[in-house]
């Protein structure tokens, strides 16, 4: 059904009117406005921006716009006692020190309150010792070091290159390996694309550029001191020793000029293979320690950052629904940045701002959406998704009963090659249908649809003629809504060509060089990719809030459940003898998936045929669709990760950014051949198959005829 049927408003106010109101020039103007000074979480500058956004959203026409504040644990460098790393000689003299701040970008030399590069939530400490190079510090890198190369990291300071996995996982792995400190650095192999100049002459990372970021392992907990509950005025806070997810060893990030000075002296073992070599002119020796002439020199870290309970502010705007005001479609993205936030987050915040303005314009002309739309400007995302998580904890009872969908709106671009979408399978058809109606901004695709350029540049690995849509992982504000509460979620942005650009993220991610000029000069001068992302995000919100029948297709969940069951079964079948010995069967899971497929098919047939003029039946069918995602939630959560409750998807235990399917079974099977008690280990596999099979079956039954 077309969207304008949702409310008894003139047909003029349909999706087209909303999309036509979105303007690239406005997004550009908003981005400029949001990026002139730093907006670090917990600072006065970010509070002022929250109030500005509140005021502007009211002007745009939202029904109400409120600030929601929380007092959460944040982390800052000591202003008078800077963090750095030294090479010290046998007398303890510092013969080399890493830089104290990044060389400022042109035009920003006199800006105050630029936080120097640091690893948020690092404990204080001044460890000294020999260096061990651990590649990306992934699980498999430590396996290679410890099991194959017999290198012991205990009591060593490890140096790891950024990329491939979330930095918090790197630190966790280093801790488990016994390291006493971690140095993170950006290697040009990962953060310098060939043939492109470094900033300010291009979009590559200069040698003095450094990636900031938190190093927590929260597993969805939110504020480390108040897991499960909002950090409000009467909150009971844990002691720091009981806080969730804090690292136990000092950690500090550096750029590749400084990394060169540390790595060029490395001795010990040679790198195991070429995948351990980056692009610096150093041997990439693993260590431990420095080579011959420098063997008496050590590395010393000087970390003096402090953890402080600090007030943060979300901005929550409401556009009340005309027909189903108790059904919420949420568009949210964060506002806090590490420095200027030229891409992360303000390229997303500027798009949200323009989407709000467009909805407000329609509302001023007499239109309302069928369902309520909530707009959110989250705080403290960079410190562990804190603003979104605290708000969701405070409003969890409303959200679990009324939440239809959550659309995330962090960075709109990480490249300018093609669209990238990660979402629940329920939204696949919505995304396909929407992108078929939008014009592609890509060169060479003039007059073609976004769907066509996206499919050509990023084809699905499984289905020909369709684009790739990825699983949701984490590392962004959808986490609490999807992984904890089971609200259907999605995200979209423009991305790079993953085939030709093998670096991780974009080169200037979380550095001082993420400026307005970076976007305006190098990524999107016409702001046409930003506009396309606004159309995708805004279009999804419009349809979710306004279509009579929710634009969810449960049959697409059936398809992926079968694919995920096949995948986890094939992983398990790498151990055929043990499966036989311990009577491990996947029959229950495949049976549940088969039942889900049949019931979903029948539900879809009923969805085509039912009387949409009967508001009770309409509401009943829509509720079955809305609550399907919720049905995949296990109230007990995953083992040792109580806030990751979705049985089908969770952030990978080895990389928070990546999504894993059937994560309970996957983790039970991971490295099972090394477990000391195989009987117990395979027992846990069987338990996880049972949980997954039960959950899929239970979810299927929510789609059955109600009586």
């Amino acid at each position: 059904k077309s969207s304008n049927e949702a409310t008894n408003i003139t047909p003029k106010h349909n999706m087209k009117a909303f999309l036509d109101e979105l303007k690239a020039e406005n997004i550009k103007k908003f981005l400029y406005n949001f990026t002139q000074i730093p907006h670090l979480a917990g600072t006065e500058q970010n509070f002022q921006l929250a109030k500005q956004i509140q005021s502007q959203w009211k002007e745009f026409g939202l029904d109400s716009v409120e600030l929601a504040h929380y007092d959460v644990l944040l982390s800052y460098p000591n202003k008078t006692h800077p963090n750095y790393i030294s090479i010290i000689n046998e007398d303890g003299n510092e013969i080399f020190n890493t830089s104290l701040f990044e060389p400022p970008p042109p035009g920003y030399e006199n800006v105050s309150d630029i936080v120097p590069p640091f690893s948020a939530f690092s404990p204080q400490g001044m460890p000294e010792g020999d260096l061990v190079y651990v590649n990306y510090a992934r699980t498999e890198d430590f396996f290679k070091l410890e099991r194959d190369m017999k290198i012991n990291c205990s009591g060593k300071i490890v140096i790891a290159r950024y990329g491939k996995v979330f930095r918090g996982n790197k630190v966790k792995n280093a801790q488990l390996a016994g390291a006493k400190g971690v140095i993170l650095y950006s290697d040009p192999a990962d953060y310098f694309a060939p043939g492109v100049k470094s900033y300010p002459d291009g979009w590559n990372l200069p040698g003095g550029g450094v990636q900031r970021g938190n190093i927590l392992n929260l597993n969805g907990a939110g504020d480390p001191l108040t897991p499960g509950y909002p950090a409000n005025e009467y909150a009971y806070r844990r002691g720091i020793a009981e806080a969730v997810g804090l690292p136990s060893i000092p950690v500090h990030p550096i750029g590749y000029y400084d990394a060169q000075k540390l790595l060029e002296k490395m001795g010990g073992s040679a790198p195991p293979d070429s995948s351990w070599r980056g692009s610096l002119k150093v041997p990439y020796n693993v260590g431990p320690g420095f080579t011959g002439n420098f063997s008496t020199q050590k590395v010393k870290m000087h970390i003096h950052s402090t953890n402080e309970v600090t007030r943060i502010y979300n901005v929550i705007g409401t556009l009340r629904g005309a027909v189903e005001p108790d059904r919420y479609v949420i568009l949210g993205g964060h506002r806090d940045s590490w420095v200027f936030g030229g891409i992360d987050p303000q390229s997303g915040a500027a798009v949200v701002h323009e989407i709000v303005r467009s909805f407000g314009t329609l509302k001023k002309e007499g239109w309302r959406p069928r369902r309520t739309i909530l707009f959110a400007s989250w705080d403290a995302e960079e410190f562990g998704l804190l603003g979104s998580t605290e708000w969701a904890e405070e409003n969890s009872r409303l959200l679990q009963e009324r939440g239809v969908a959550y659309i995330n709106a962090d960075s709109s671009i990480e490249g300018n090659y093609t669209l990238r979408v990660d979402c629940t399978p329920l939204m696949y058809s919505l995304v396909h249908n929407l992108t078929k109606e939008l014009k592609s901004p890509d060169e060479g695709f003039e007059g073609k649809s976004l769907y066509e350029s996206w499919t050509k540049k990023s084809p699905s690995p499984e289905f020909s003629g369709m684009p790739r849509i990825s699983k949701l992982g984490s590392g962004n504000d959808f986490e609490v809504f999807f992984q904890r509460l089971g609200i259907a979620s999605g995200r979209a942005r423009y991305t790079k060509n993953w085939e030709t650009n093998k670096f991780s993220g974009y080169p200037l991610y979380h550095s001082v060089y993420e400026t307005y000029e970076l976007v305006e000069k190098f990524y999107d001068p016409m702001f046409k990719y930003h506009l396309t992302v606004a159309q995708v995000r805004g279009g999804m919100v419009f349809e979710l809030a306004n279509s009579i029948v929710l634009p969810f297709d449960c049959r697409d969940y059936a398809v992926v459940l079968r694919k995920y069951a096949d995948k986890i079964y094939s992983i398990s079948m790498k151990h055929p003898q043990e499966m036989k010995t311990y009577s491990v069967s996947f029959d229950s899971l495949f049976s549940a998936v088969k039942n889900f497929t049949e019931i979903a098919s029948k539900f879809s047939e009923r969805l085509q045929d039912f009387d949409k003029s009967n508001p009770i039946v309409l509401r009943m069918m829509n509720d079955q669709l809305m609550f399907l995602e919720r049905a995949f939630i296990d109230p007990l959560g995953l083992p040792d990760r109580p806030f990751y409750r979705h049985v089908i998807y969770a952030p990978s235990s080895h990389n928070k950014y990546a999504g894993e399917s059937f994560p309970g079974i996957y983790d039970a099977l991971f490295d099972i051949e090394s477990k000391v008690d195989p009987s117990k280990a395979w027992g846990e596999v069987k338990r996880q198959i049972y949980v997954a099979a039960f959950t899929v079956q239970a979810a299927a039954e929510t789609l059955s005829e109600v009586a």
């Epitope: 830089s99 030399e109 006199n110 060169q260």
Partner: nanobody, 126 residues
Framework: EVQLVESGGGLVKPGGSLRLSCAAS????????MYWVRQAPGKGLEWVAV????????NYADSVKGRFTISRDNSKNTLFLQMNSLRVEDTAVYYC???????????????????RGQGTMVTVSS
């Protein structure tokens, strides 16, 4: 226009101290490694000390190590050289010089410098 203006030179007895200053204008000191170099009468140019853009690293010529200290105040766009235990052989014209932009170079002595000031004369004599 880029300008470097040195001051603080003068006549001092052996064992005495001087503090040289260098006021920079026309560019932001914060982005540049900075040098003190000197030229003794009838001799070539000799580098004395270098400081990285952020002050994290300082290098000294062996002849002045332990006696001279280079420092900077980026907020005031000023470079300093504290000279203690002065010797007769320290007599020279002292120049401050601008190194490479730290966005393009690591700011170490081998990166060299491009612009220097007019210099200030230091005479060490009894």
């Amino acid at each position: 226009e880029v300008q470097l203006v040195e001051s603080g030179g003068g006549l001092v007895k052996p064992g005495g101290s001087l503090r040289l200053s260098c006021a920079a204008s026309g560019f932001n000191l914060i982005s540049y490694g900075m040098y003190w170099v000197r030229q003794a009468p009838g001799k070539g140019l000799e580098w004395v000390a270098v400081i990285s853009y952020d002050g994290s690293n300082k290098n000294y010529a062996d002849s002045v190590k332990g006696r001279f200290t280079i420092s900077r105040d980026n907020s005031k766009n000023t470079l300093f050289l504290q000279m203690n235990s002065l010797r007769v052989e320290d007599t020279a014209v002292y120049y401050c010089a601008k190194g490479g932009n730290a966005l393009y170079s690591s700011g170490w002595p081998d990166d060299g410098f491009d612009i220097r000031g007019q210099g200030t004369m230091v005479t060490v004599s009894s």
